[in-house]
């Protein structure tokens, strides 16, 4: 049986049940290399409390559809009077990066995971030439996820004192110059994740090979190497390589750009101080507030919730967008869709799409940016579920009793962007991270 998602095959992936202190290792095409789980385990559960291992999915007992992968085992589970077996079930959804498997829940018999990934899309528009896993768990099983830094087009310019060269990088995947052919990037070779531009020439100085690694809980490392044997004439016989170290800052701060810290014989060392390198619980919340010891800030957007069936309205040329954030009030136009953001075509108001649902909500505060994300909306033709990204800005004199109103700023591949000036986005910092 052919592997259903070949681009996910090269790696053993990890997911965590934080509530029960369990680490899962997942290999969807072969078996995980963990002796204690046996030679054919595709999903191996490592219980850190008891220091035991259990196979909860066998690579030989795999069944697949386009959006669901199931691994059975021969181990019976405790449902009296039945012959159920322990199994793992992975639901795949279209995403814009390789993404990460997320643990959802586990019953007596089934361990459930969800995975938003380019591998599950109906079209190849989000697929990279080369992409590697872009997240890691530290020794405390806290997730550090750099997926939000991945550029789907264009690249990051590295801060470098050399006036004759410019080094551009992407995170965990190659630079897509076709979708955003910026003048300097146009000459970058396909597949490169680190592109050195000298005048009108561009050179591949590194491609992603291995996934993100954790060296300490506040330092993550990504390494790129040039795969081809052909040496560059300005590298003194050495093969180019790039090491990017992502550093979680010791306290809340604005974002910085990546900085070149060392360069020798085409070996480039880059340091990037960014809160995306911090563990995810420091940056994100599933509710509309971020507060407490862990986050170093107090943010509460819940006053922006609208009651009584009214919504915020944002004009998007062809479409009107109705928004109701931080609550579970149905938007009238999007009745029964559980939408937080509802897209209605002006020329045909019967064409209504959920552009993100209220129970698929993430509030993120990272590198000084406050963002509310609603995902899991109605599918586009690519298979990607519509989502909305609302960027908040502090404005103490915002109208509408300080609430302000959302402004639609554009759409890219079924992701809808809004900015929202409001006094409720004014962040209160505590300094003790």
């Amino acid at each position: 049986q052919a592997a259903p998602f070949p681009e996910l095959c090269s790696y053993t992936w990890e997911a965590v049940d934080t509530k029960n202190n369990v680490l899962y290792k997942i290999n969807i095409c072969g078996s995980v290399d963990i002796v204690q789980c046996g030679p054919s385990s595709a999903v191996c559960m490592h219980d850190l409390k008891t220091r035991t291992y259990h196979s909860v999915g066998d690579s030989v007992l795999r069944s697949a559809t386009r959006s669901l992968l199931e691994f059975n085992t021969t181990v019976s589970c405790d449902q009296q009077g039945t012959n159920h077996r322990v199994q793992s079930s992975i639901a795949f959804l279209c995403g814009k990066t390789l993404g990460t498997p997320e643990f959802v829940t586990a019953t007596e018999c089934v361990h459930y995971f969800e995975w938003r990934t380019t591998a599950a899309c109906k079209k190849d528009i989000f697929k990279a030439n080369k992409e590697v896993p872009c997240y890691v768990f530290d020794e405390e099983l806290r997730k550090h996820d750099l997926n939000p830094l991945i550029k789907l087009s264009g690249a990051y310019l590295v801060d470098d004192s050399d006036p004759d060269t410019s080094l551009f990088i992407n995170v965990c995947r190659d630079i897509d110059t076709l979708r955003d052919p910026g003048s300097q990037l146009r000459a970058c070779p396909p597949g490169t994740a680190a592109c050195l531009v000298r005048g009108h020439q561009a050179f591949d100085v590194g491609q992603p090979r291995d996934g993100l690694k954790v060296v300490r809980k506040d330092r993550l490392v990504l390494s790129y190497v040039r795969e081809e044997a052909g040496k560059l004439d300005f590298c003194d016989g050495h093969s180019p390589a790039v090491t990017i170290t992502f550093v979680c800052p010791s306290e809340r701060r604005e974002g910085t750009i990546p900085k070149l810290t060392a360069k020798s014989n085409c070996r480039y060392e880059i340091e990037w101080i960014t809160e995306y390198a911090c563990h995810r619980d420091y940056l994100e919340s599933k509710t509309c507030s971020l507060s407490g010891e862990q986050q170093d800030v107090s943010i509460d957007l819940t006053p922006l919730a609208q009651s009584g069936g009214s919504s915020y309205i944002s004009d998007g040329k062809e479409y009107l967008f109705y928004l109701n954030v931080c609550g579970e009030t149905e938007i009238q136009f999007c009745n029964k869709k559980q939408a937080a953001v509802c897209q209605v075509k002006k020329s045909d108001t019967s064409q209504v799409k959920a552009a993100g649902r209220y129970h698929n909500q993430t509030l993120r505060y990272s590198d000084g940016d406050l963002t509310l994300i609603y995902f899991g909306g109605d599918e586009c033709s690519s298979g990607f579920q519509r989502m909305s990204v609302i960027n908040f800005r502090c404005n103490k004199t915002a109208g509408n009793d300080g609430k302000g109103t959302p402004v639609f700023t554009g759409e890219v591949d079924c992701t809808y962007f809004f900015t929202w000036d409001t006094e409720y986005a004014c962040v209160h910092h505590h300094h003790h991270h």
């Epitope: 049940d17 934080t18 509530k19 029960n20 202190n21 409390k49 589970c77 586990a106 018999c109 361990h111």
Partner: nanobody
Framework: QVQLQESGGGLVQPGGSLRLSCAAS????????MDWYRQAPGKQREWVAT???????TYADSVKGRFTISRDNTKNTVYLRMNSLKPEDTAVYYC??????????WGQGTQVTVSS
């Protein structure tokens, strides 16, 4: 105050059965993962079974097929049903509760002796 109290231990013949109970107080019981451990005389404490907060269960190889862990959230109690008991099951049995927000909590233990 957070407490766990085991009961149900005793003397039983080989091949017999017992049901141990572990009653919890002072915690949101359903949010916690529950484990049973045992310690035989002169030996280290060993893990026996786990019932996670979501409901999945795992067992040590030595008790698989003989022991069953379950819980009753209305009574804040976790059970360990032990069938086909063997002399090597003789030990003090402890229950443990844990969650991301609490340190591990142990009970005082209950003695199980399997002997003819």
């Amino acid at each position: 105050q957070v407490q766990l109290q085991e009961s149900g231990g005793g003397l039983v013949q080989p091949g017999g059965s017992l049901r141990l109970s572990c009653a919890a107080s002072g915690i949101i019981f359903s949010d916690n993962r529950m484990d049973w451990y045992r310690q035989a005389p002169g030996k280290q404490r060993e893990w026996v079974a786990t019932l996670a907060s979501y409901g999945w269960k795992t067992y040590a190889d030595s008790v698989k097929g003989r022991f069953t862990i379950s819980r009753d959230n209305t009574k804040n109690t976790v059970y360990l049903r032990m069938n086909s008991l063997k002399p090597e099951d003789t030990a003090v049995y402890y229950c443990k509760a844990s969650s991301p927000v609490l340190n591990d909590i142990w009970g005082q233990g209950t003695q199980v002796t399997v002997s003819s």
